[in-house]
Amino acid sequence: MAVTACQGLGFVVSLIGIAGIIAATCMDQWSTQDLYNNPVTAVFNYQGLWRSCVRESSGFTECRGYFTLLGLPAMLQAVRALMIVGIVLGAIGLLVSIFALKCIRIGSMEDSAKANMTLTSGIMFIVSGLCAIAGVSVFANMLVTNFWMSTANMYTGMGGMVQTVQTRYTFGAALFVGWVAGGLTLIGGVMMCIACRGLAPEETNYKAVSYHASGHSVAYKPGGFKASTGFGSNTKNKKIYDGGARTEDEVQSYPSKHDYV
C-alpha cells in the first residue's frame, strides 16, 4: 500500500513539476525591467526565451518574437535547449510512469516490469528536473552578470551632457516557477525511484523440478531464490516453500505439473 502511495504521489508531483516547466518555458517574464527606486514606470520591459515585451502605462502591450536564430546569445540557446530537453524527458517519463502505476493493470504485466518502468520514469524525472533547474540557473546567472555590468555603466553619455538610461533586468516570475517546477519534478523522480525498490518482487517462485538423489527416495525441490534487480540489498538466498503466504507485491505463480511429486 505504501509503495502504491509513494508511486502515485511521485507521479502527481512530477506531473505538476513538468506542467510548471512547460509553463515557465512558455512564459514571457524570464527577466523583467528592474524598477529599483521607481515602482511605477511609463514603459515596462520584460523578456522571455522566445520573445520580448513592452507594456505601456495605458496597458498596451507589444511583444516581438526573436526571429533570428544565429543572432541570439549562445547562453539563451543553451537555456532553451535545456528546458526543451527537460520537457521532452519529462513527457516521456510521464508516459512510461502511467503504464508503471500499480493501480493500472495492463494485460499480464509483471511487477518486475512495472518496477523497471517506475525506475526508468524516475530517472527521467530526475534528469528532467535537473535540466530545468540548470536552465533557469544559467539564465539567472546571465541576468546577474548583465545586471552588475549595466549598473557599472548605468549612465553612458557624451561628455556628460546627454544621459542614456540603460535598462537593467532582474529575475522574472518564470525563473521562480522554473526553479520550483524543476524541484518538484526532481522530488517526484526520487519518489518514483523509492517506489521502484518496493515494487521489485522480494521473492520469485521458480517452478520446481524434482531431482532424485541416488540412494534416497526423497524428492529434492530447489528453493526459489530472490530475483536480482540490482537494487536489492538482501543478498541472502531465501528458501521458498509452497503454500506460504504471498503478499500482493509478490509475483503470483501457478502450479505446474512439476510442482508436486
Epitope: 521607481n38 514606470t41 511609463a42 514603459v43 515585451c53 495605458s58 546627454v162 538610461v165 535598462t167
Partner: antibody
Framework: QTYLQQSGAELVRSGASVKMSCKAS????????IHWVKQTPGQGLEWIGY????????HYNQKFRDKATLTADTSSSTAYMQISSLTSEDSAVYFC????????????WGQGTLVTVSA | DIVMSQSPSSLTVTTGEKVTMTCKSS????????????LAWYQQKPGQPPKLLIY???IRESGVPDRFTGSGSGTDFTLTIISVQAEDLAIYYC?????????LGGGTKLEIK
Amino acid sequence: QTYLQQSGAELVRSGASVKMSCKASGYTFASYNIHWVKQTPGQGLEWIGYIYPGKDGSHYNQKFRDKATLTADTSSSTAYMQISSLTSEDSAVYFCARGGYYGNSFDYWGQGTLVTVSA
Amino acid sequence: DIVMSQSPSSLTVTTGEKVTMTCKSSQSLLNSGNLKNYLAWYQQKPGQPPKLLIYWASIRESGVPDRFTGSGSGTDFTLTIISVQAEDLAIYYCQNAYTFPFTLGGGTKLEIK
C-alpha cells in the same frame, strides 16, 4: 465620439481648496487613464499625474504629490482633481486628457478649467 | 526628471513654406525593448486645448494631415510641416512619454506672415 467635458472656471481664495471635474463620454471610461495637465503662461505645460479608473490606481508627479488629489467615479464616468492649500502659483488652466492607447500620449483633451486664486 | 528643450521658441513663415522645429531631451527616449522612441508632438491653437499630432516620434495620429512629419531618435527630434497652411498657426509642444514624470517642452510658436 470621444469627449471630455470639464467643469467651469473657479475663483477661489488663497489657502482654500478647489475640486474640478472631467466627465468622459464616447468610450469605456474604466479602460483608459485620465491625465491632468497644468498650463501657466510662465511654466508652460506641466504634467500633474494620472488616474486609472479601472483599478482606481494613480500616479503623481512628485512636484504635485502634496498639492493634488486625483479620484474617479466609474458609475458617472467622471474624474476629479482636488487642489488644496491654494496660492497664487496655482492660478492656471487645468486640463484633463485621456491617455492614448499607444505611446503614452494624450489623445483627447478637455477644454480646460481656469482656476484663479485671489488674495 | 527629463528636460525637454525646444527650438526655436518662435518662427514666422509664409503659407506653403516648409517648417522644421526641433526638440532635444536630456535623456534618450529610445526604449531598447521595442526600439521605439517615446516622444509625442502636440499642437495648441489659440484658446483651445492641445491636440495630439504625433506619437512614438514618427507615427501620425489618425486624422492628422500628412504634411506633419515627425522624425528623430534618442535625444534629437524634429517636427516638419511640409507646406504650412494658415490653420497651422499654433504653439507646438513635444512631450517625453518615456519616463515619469512626463515632461513637455516650452513650445515653438508658429506665426504666419
